[in-house]
Interface confidence: low
């Protein structure tokens, strides 16, 4: 017995939709059936229908077919929403292009190539002919529409209304000419429904002849409509399963759009200096991962073999060895040139702020009167008059209300780091605005510093090398874990807050991180009784350029014999030169059989000017940096201790005076380390602790 072909692939489905006829003269036919496939077969063959079937509705609740001689484009008809209905329209009647010779074309073009109006098929004026609708049943010789009932070369044609021109072909394009895609067609949502060899595509919502997992309801964003070619899985171009039982799938012949433009919805905003969203549009030239390891070229297979080549990922700008996000990862990344580290994120690229033209402030911006009203993370500022109670809570004088108009960025509390505003977002009560200090403005924001000159040096990841194992009074030391591995140090400065470095967060997903407290061994061995493991609930990034992060814990740490907080210095304080200090960390220690124990290295404070000299004058320190040199040659911070503290004692009080960030080399003799100067940011830290809500224990 010959297997009857399944014709539902010839229909365009509109879920939860039905057609209502406004014109009562329009006919309709109904019948109880089990499946939409049965409706389709009958519609295609016009079996037992008193009209040419152009569409049908399947009523899922009543298991009923409603066949129509019209479709949604016909006059006297309107579309209506209905949960139980699915509308199927024969693609031949709504397609405005032809496949092959256009034998199946049933569209409504009725003008010839040279612009002459077509003669109706049922008329013999001005040209007599034998192409009567009754003689060519199923060929839809309706009205005066262009048709190709015999499948002749040249495509659809018609007799013309011009007595001088008997017939002429119509200018209906090939579907393969109309359809075009950008890049590899991942965003293609066109109507191509056959493969490059001409095979008809299988519907995505069908499992015959080929079973597959690309179910429309499982992938609602992949555009699995009807049986159109799609690229859901990052292939070189769109493809589909075919109706040929012997050919599971095949690519479709869809040309690349001439100007290669994408819809606005598909194009990630291109940036070169910063990351917007997940950085899929980042087109800058950063070419190292977060810890300074250089990237491998995208067109190279050494040291890592991969498929992320410029040929496979067109439009993703996989040039040179620049950080990119071709695959929808959480941020730009690259393969690295280190054979032991396959990939890394380039999380040192800053998030785009909302920089607004030439707006700038002088000093600390307390006199700034511009009208920017957006934070650096893009949040809209809330009105000052709604936040006065909060403002009074952390300043001890009456703010100048005349300056606090509308929701403009201002600096009513003399913040050292520039204008800010309240946001109305309970998670981020306030934040700084993306305004820079005016060029050439050298007003120091705090006094008693050598030279407030910005430094630009940066180097590799840091670890404590050749330190002495330590156990006493280090309860404030935090091991920040990234995907269960130690990545950075940190200091517990309050039960719910850890001070650490911005470079410690390669991923934006907070679920990737946890804080281990009360440990001495980096793996927690032997620390089970004293260890506290806490999730991270928020990251508060420090003022622009600070490299600091305040990490909020999901619940407060319990202070005990093993876990304690460390004090912060007073804002703007200076500590005498030669003061003895220490850095702490679990990073690689220079020993072959590294035991994983927390190390300490002893350093002494050095003035910024002297420090600059030790760096052969190549480094000029600014007011936000502090310098400390090793007492022991080759001892100091090195790779892996970012975020950890520089701890100093003054008047019998131990404080965190510096934070280790990617700095100026690793334990090099006569090269002191440069740290973020916590005293410069102390007011910011206090302000965050005071204004950000934390969970109660």
């Amino acid at each position: 017995q010959r297997k009857r072909r399944n014709t539902i692939h010839e229909f365009k489905k509109s879920a939860k939709t039905t057609l209502i006829k406004i014109d009562p003269a329009l006919k309709i036919k109904t019948k109880k059936v089990n499946t939409a496939d049965q409706c389709a077969n009958r519609c295609t063959r016009n079996k037992g229908l008193p009209f040419t079937c152009k569409a049908f509705v399947f009523d899922k609740a009543r298991k009923q077919c409603l066949w129509f001689p019209f479709n949604s484009m016909s006059s006297g008809v309107k579309k209506e929403f209905g949960h139980e209905f699915d509308l199927y329209e024969n693609k031949d009647y709504i397609r405005n292009c032809i496949i092959g010779k256009g034998r199946s074309y049933k569209g409504t073009v009725s003008i010839t190539k040279s612009g002459i109006k077509c003669q109706p098929w049922s008329s013999m004026i001005p040209h007599e002919h034998s192409f009567l609708p009754s003689s060519y049943r199923g060929k839809d010789l309706q009205e005066n529409y262009c048709r190709n009932p015999r499948g002749e070369e040249g495509g659809p044609w018609c007799f013309t209304s011009n007595p001088e021109v008997r017939y002429e072909v119509c200018d209906i394009p090939q579907c393969s000419e109309v359809e075009c895609m950008t890049c590899n067609g991942e965003s293609y949502r066109g109507l191509m429904d056959h493969t490059e060899s001409g095979k008809i595509c299988q519907r995505w919502d069908h499992q015959t002849p080929h079973r597959h997992k690309f179910l429309p309801e499982r992938y609602p964003d992949k555009g699995f409509d009807d049986n159109y070619c799609r690229n859901p899985d990052g292939q070189p171009r769109p493809w589909c399963y075919t109706l040929d039982p012997h050919t599971r799938w095949e690519y479709c012949a869809i040309k690349t759009c001439a100007d290669n433009t994408m819809n606005d919805t598909d194009v990630p905003l291109e940036t070169t200096e910063c990351i917007q969203g997940q950085g899929e549009g980042y087109r800058g030239t950063v070419n190292t991962i977060w810890n300074g390891i250089p990237c491998q070229r995208w067109d190279s297979q050494y040291p890592h073999e991969h498929d992320m080549t410029p040929e496979n990922f067109k439009c993703k700008d996989l040039r040179e060895n620049y950080c990119r996000n071709p695959d929808g990862s959480e941020s730009p990344w690259c393969f690295t040139t280190d054979p032991n580290i396959r990939v890394g994120y380039c999380s040192q690229i800053p998030n785009c702020d909302m920089s607004h033209g030439q707006d700038c402030y002088r000093g600390n911006g307390k006199n700034y009167m511009g009208n920017l009203s957006q934070t650096r993370s893009g949040l809209t500022c809330s009105m000052w008059d709604k936040n006065m109670e909060d403002l009074h809570r952390h300043i001890f004088w009456e703010p100048d209300a005349s300056k606090l108009n509308e929701n403009y960025c201002r600096n009513p509390d003399d913040d050292a780091h520039g204008p800010w505003c309240y946001t109305g977002n309970p998670l981020i009560p306030w934040d700084y605005c993306p305004i820079s200090r005016c060029e050439g403005d050298t007003t120091p924001t705090i006094v008693n510093l050598d030279h407030p000159v910005i430094s630009c040096a940066k180097t590799k990841q840091l670890r404590v090398v050749n330190g002495i194992p330590t156990r006493t009074n280090i309860g404030w030391m935090v091991s920040l874990r990234y995907r269960n591995k130690h990545i950075c140090g940190g200091s517990l400065i309050k039960e719910s807050w850890v001070l650490t470095a911005r470079q410690c967060f390669p991923s934006r997903d907070l679920k990737d991180y946890e804080a281990w407290l009360g440990i001495h061994d980096v793996h927690g061995r032997g620390d089970e009784k004293c260890k506290q493991v806490l999730n991270v609930s928020q990251l508060v990034y420090g003022p622009e350029g600070s490299d600091l992060v305040l990490m909020k814990l999901a619940r407060p740490a319990v202070l005990d014999d093993f876990v304690s907080t460390i004090d912060l210095p007073n804002y703007g304080c200076t500590i005498p030169e030669k003061t003895s200090c220490s850095v702490y960390g679990w990073g690689y220690t220079g020993l072959i059989n590294y035991d994983g124990l927390l190390r300490v290295a002893h350093l002494y404070i050095m003035g910024n000017e002297k420090c600059s000299q030790h760096h052969r004058g190549k480094v000029t320190l600014n007011e936000s940096e502090i310098c400390a040199g090793a007492e022991k040659i080759g001892s100091g911070p090195c790779e892996g201790d970012y975020g950890g503290p520089l701890v100093c004692e003054q008047h019998k009080m131990r404080m965190v005076l510096g934070v280790i960030v990617p700095g100026r080399g690793c334990a090099i003799p006569n090269r002191p380390g440069i740290f973020v100067r916590v005293a410069y940011y102390a007011k910011w830290i206090h302000k965050i602790i005071l204004t950000y809500k934390v969970p109660q224990s």
Partner: antibody
Framework: SVEESGGRLVPPGTPLTLTCTVS????????MGWVRQAPGKGLEYIGM?????STYYADWAKGRLTISKTPTTVDLEITSPTTEDTATYFC????????????????WGQGTLVTVSS | QVLTQTPSPVSAAVGGTVTINCQAS????????FSWYQQKPGQPPKLLIY???TLASGVPSRFKGSGSGTQFTLTISGVQCGDAATYYC?????????????FGGGTEVVVK
């Protein structure tokens, strides 16, 4: 190849992340799954992450375990382990989506043992 | 969805035939999204059969999968010593908008 790591002894309630490192497998072309096996017991499906990064979990695993991925690793986070979570955890590749309908796991790692005990 | 494997354990002589059944508590949608695995002690499972009857790459033709609906069968003919292992069936079923996967409890095959 597929290799799991991160298994160790943890006290109950201590979050744990297992990492599955793949080589020679393009995670933008293959879905990956996690399956576990308690000592002396049978296989238990945990969940999968598909090529687009969407995750699917067994009913019992929803909210208890989280699967995520980077370009070369697939992670399984056990948010609050209990003693019932003691098992060998296998990471496995799902057979090419376009060559079969089945969720067949055609390439497995050796597994990593997680012991949850106080 | 529960997959019940019978019998367990099952013993066979070298050269003999072993049949393992797997009964599903509900029919698998798309009837045949079904796999069989072999696992030896201390090793990960190895895929033998997928799509109910398709032999995985490198698996000898002595292994044969069959069945549909709720009843599936793995037949090992010409049993060899190396076939001693635990065999698991695996199927998937619809749950919400996703697919869920279930394994059978395993059948131990002892070769005499």
């Amino acid at each position: 190849s597929v290799e799991e790591s991160g298994g160790r002894l943890v006290p109950p309630g201590t979050p744990l992340t297992l990492t599955c490192t793949v080589s020679g497998i393009d995670l933008s072309s293959y879905a990956m799954g996690w399956v576990r096996q308690a000592p002396g017991k049978g296989l238990e499906y945990i969940g999968m992450i598909d090529v687009s990064g969407s995750t699917y979990y067994a009913d019992w695993a929803k909210g208890r375990l989280t699967i995520s991925k980077t370009p070369t690793t697939v992670d399984l986070e056990i948010t609050s382990p209990t003693t019932e979570d003691t098992a060998t955890y296998f990471c496995a590749r799902l057979i090419d989506e376009r060559s079969t309908y089945s969720y067949a796991f055609d390439l497995w790692g050796q597994g990593t043992l997680v012991t949850v005990s106080s | 969805q529960v997959l019940t494997q019978t019998p367990s354990p099952v013993s066979a002589a070298v050269g003999g035939t072993v049949t393992i059944n797997c009964q599903a508590s509900q029919s698998f949608y798309n009837n045949g999204a079904f796999s069989w695995y072999q696992q030896k002690p201390g090793q990960p499972p190895k895929l033998l059969i997928y799509d109910a009857s398709t032999l995985a790459s490198g698996v000898p033709s002595r292994f044969k999968g069959s069945g549909s609906g709720t009843q599936f069968t793995l037949t090992i003919s010409g049993v060899q010593c190396g076939d001693a292992a635990t065999y698991y069936c695996q199927g998937e079923f619809s749950c919400g908008s996703a697919d869920c996967v279930a394994f059978g409890g395993g059948t131990e095959v002892v070769v005499k």
